[in-house]
Amino acid sequence: NKGTDDATADSRKTYTLTDYLKNTYRLKLYSLRWISDHEYLYKQENNILVFNAEYGNSSVFLENSTFDEFGHSINDYSISPDGQFILLEYNYVKQWRHSYTASYDIYDLNKRQLITEERIPNNTQWVTWSPVGHKLAYVWNNDIYVKIEPNLPSYRITWTGKEDIIYNGITDWVYEEEVFSAYSALWWSPNGTFLAYAQFNDTEVPLIEYSFYSDESLQYPKTVRVPYPKAGAVNPTVKFFVVNTDSLSSVTNATSIQITAPASMLIGDHYLCDVTWATQERISLQWLRRIQNYSVMDICDYDESSGRWNCLVARQHIEMSTTGWVGRFRPSEPHFTLDGNSFYKIISNEEGYRHICYFQIDKKDCTFITKGTWEVIGIEALTSDYLYYISNEYKGMPGGRNLYKIQLSDYTKVTCLSCELNPERCQYYSVSFSKEAKYYQLRCSGPGLPLYTLHSSVNDKGLRVLEDNSALDKMLQNVQMPSKKLDFIILNETKFWYQMILPPHFDKSKKYPLLLDVYAGPCSQKADTVFRLNWATYLASTENIIVASFDGRGSGYQGDKIMHAINRRLGTFEVEDQIEAARQFSKMGFVDNKRIAIWGWSYGGYVTSMVLGSGSGVFKCGIAVAPVSRWEYYDSVYTERYMGLPTPEDNLDHYRNSTVMSRAENFKQVEYLLIHGTADDNVHFQQSAQISKALVDVGVDFQAMWYTDEDHGIASSTAHQHIYTHMSHFIKQCFSLP
């Protein structure tokens, strides 16, 4: 920061609540889409430009005037892999976190005209180009259709789709949210010959029902009904199919071939959790038992003579956990070599750190190619010579991210490609590789302002800066910005990391109020090196509040000893560790221990509530937004991963003694603000309604706010501004700030 160390002498403005809510200072992105191994698309002033990666020269791929007469606001576009057509998306209607419906039109780039015949229907649920050429697969009314040519009729692949009952090629609520993190349940083979898809059956899944109040003129509220399996309830079932899209018939119905789950899965409830094509005629499927400590990978080959898919038992790979669950959230995806005979996968090693292991499809055991007291975050690219991955190895900082490459002919030859590029400014990288990994874009997101650069894999040479946020840098020179401290404390001989957003001109000899910003869910990370402009920036800059976050037991990317500590025990150690962190912070000398608050959203709202209900005496007040209050209210896939089943034989006791409601009496000692959206499809309003009831029943005075028709994000423009303004007032009142 410019100016003096003396806050009173610094005449620059602070970062205000309005700055946050109105997004006054915007971080510039550089969102590119690779279309080949040397070209990418980039949108500039609504023109779509095509750039040559090597030389940086560009030409207009599509002028912004092309669709002036279109008559619809285009939400998104997607170019066919052969560059002949562009799919235009409009009439976007959000459903859940990832899912939406939309209308689509196809523009012929050769003829420079919209295709008017055989259009994709309105309210389509998902559309995807084949990986090569210009086939299209789409889902409409829960059934799958394939277009071989954009101007020709679709081939109907499935006929069983039924709203809220049978889902073909799309996920139901719980698979979307907790398994695939996507609406799509379609997977094209690499050359577009085969289309694999999942079918979900929610016939027996109980419905969550909630009111949607809509416009003031609606006399009777609408009731939204969603098949949503809560912990211990009946789950969706899944089937998996493959269809050959090179042999669809103009007259007869398509034939889909089913691949059944392994026998070890069929003995009980199970999930399909990963689908990866290995080659044109080899597919890998990962299945997971409902008790999520046991998974199986099947590798299946196409038999041309029978038209069937054969999954040899000898090629099955079992992954299990004795200390918790498989994977960070689910089993990791395999990255196959070109011949499909081997693959690389992130799994837990014997020390409980997640590293890359090399598998051969016909062998049970694998060879770890990375090791250490750090973790591989993701495999980003695989070529014939190198594997590229992101890890948090550098300087032993779990909250950092860097890009590495490892030589496949000699695993000892590892190079960090990003560590020394800009070590002060850039410690948290993500990457986007071109189609065959000849080039890559590095996206640095902190601790300095975001920086986007382009690189060549041939010599790992930096080619050019794509965006350096210099305009924002210049603007922020005139703002009293907070600083960010990332450090660790040692508890029971274990390092636990925290971050603090410190007010401008922070003076460790002074006493500051502290707000603990908590999430603390399994495999979470809140202490990192990312630059953010958020509510905390305002609180620190304008209100001189320290905003701290702490990654305690249960947090991720530091080994299973820490992450699996809360296995079967949600609401215990991760809650206690937030309290202990606050105690440690108050011992640092610059925290006013009479003005410590806590807040969190979702899992963070649960932890906030459990902390405030603990009777620790550490916290004066807190805010819980959309909190879980009892694990039997939350979805089966997420909850049971960590808690097992709510049955007497399994873990019912802990389900029952980890509720917020059971701590109601202790809320008399704190000031509590409880907030929830009435149309939250994820953490149901029910959860806050039960907290409220329990507090009322024991005579606790507390504050509450509901947001009508808002979902888990409370993200509509007006609600977003309202909630943060409301929370700001609450925190300022709690801290006796003017």
Epitope: I148, E149, N151, P153, S247, S250, V251
Partner: antibody, heavy 116, light 110 residues
């Protein structure tokens, strides 16, 4: 068994409208495309247009200004109307089930003569 | 419009092979699909689908009928020809609208 039967007047005066009905039995007309095709006396065959499952229509550009294809799902029927006919419209008119632009089931045909 | 050209008449002896050709003015194929179909029409009857997608036999069609070809050149083969096969044979493309038919090939017995 899927069956399509065309019906309508066999004689139409020039400049008037030709109207034909196709009655479908054996399946619901909302499940497929349905097309009208005509065959001229010299054996030339011409696709007139179709009505899709969704109810939207597509016509042969050569007839677009004069043709209309509609349906009545409650009666499982669909209809052809051709306006301002001339002797050039004399033909046998067929309705057909029309999957992927392939006519897999045809009606027996209705012979229409345009003459004063 | 895509124009389909057929020769008007083909005369063959019973029991022999009949090869009826259809040429399109532009390709009606993609890398994996051939959008060409064949119909048989006997005098006084409606057309009947014989072959779809260039080579697939429609239901209840005898195996002596077969189809082949891709791009612009397609063939309907009847082997061996029987007396019952006397009819006019039409090709039809479905690669793009408007759908178009060939002018028909009349099969005659020598």
């Amino acid at each position: 068994e899927v069956k399509l039967v065309e019906s309508g007047p066999g004689l139409v005066k020039p400049s008037q409208s030709l109207s034909l009905t196709c009655s479908v039995t054996g399946y619901f007309i909302t499940g497929n495309y349905l097309a009208w095709i005509r065959k001229f006396p010299g054996n030339k065959m011409e696709w007139i247009g179709h009505i899709k499952s969704s109810g939207t229509t597509t016509y042969n550009p050569s007839l677009k200004s004069r043709v209309s294809i509609t349906r009545d799902t409650s009666k499982n029927q669909f209809f052809l109307q051709l306006n301002s006919v001339t002797s050039e419209d004399t033909a046998t008119y067929y309705c057909a089930r029309h999957g992927h632009y392939v006519m897999d089931v045809w009606g027996q045909g209705a012979s229409v003569t345009v003459s004063s | 419009d895509i124009v389909l050209t057929q020769s008007p008449v083909l005369a063959v002896s019973l029991g022999q092979r009949a090869t009826i050709s259809c040429r399109a003015s532009q390709s009606v194929s993609t890398s994996t699909y051939n959008f060409m179909h064949w119909y048989q029409q006997k005098p006084g009857q409606q057309p009947r689908l014989l072959i779809y997608d260039a080579s697939h036999l429609a239901s209840s069609v005898p195996a002596r009928f077969s189809g082949s070809g891709s791009g612009t050149d397609f063939t309907l083969t009847i082997n061996p020809v029987q007396a019952d096969d006397i009819a006019t044979y039409y090709c039809q493309q479905s690669r793009e609208l408007p759908l178009t038919f060939g002018s028909g090939t009349k099969l005659e017995i020598k």
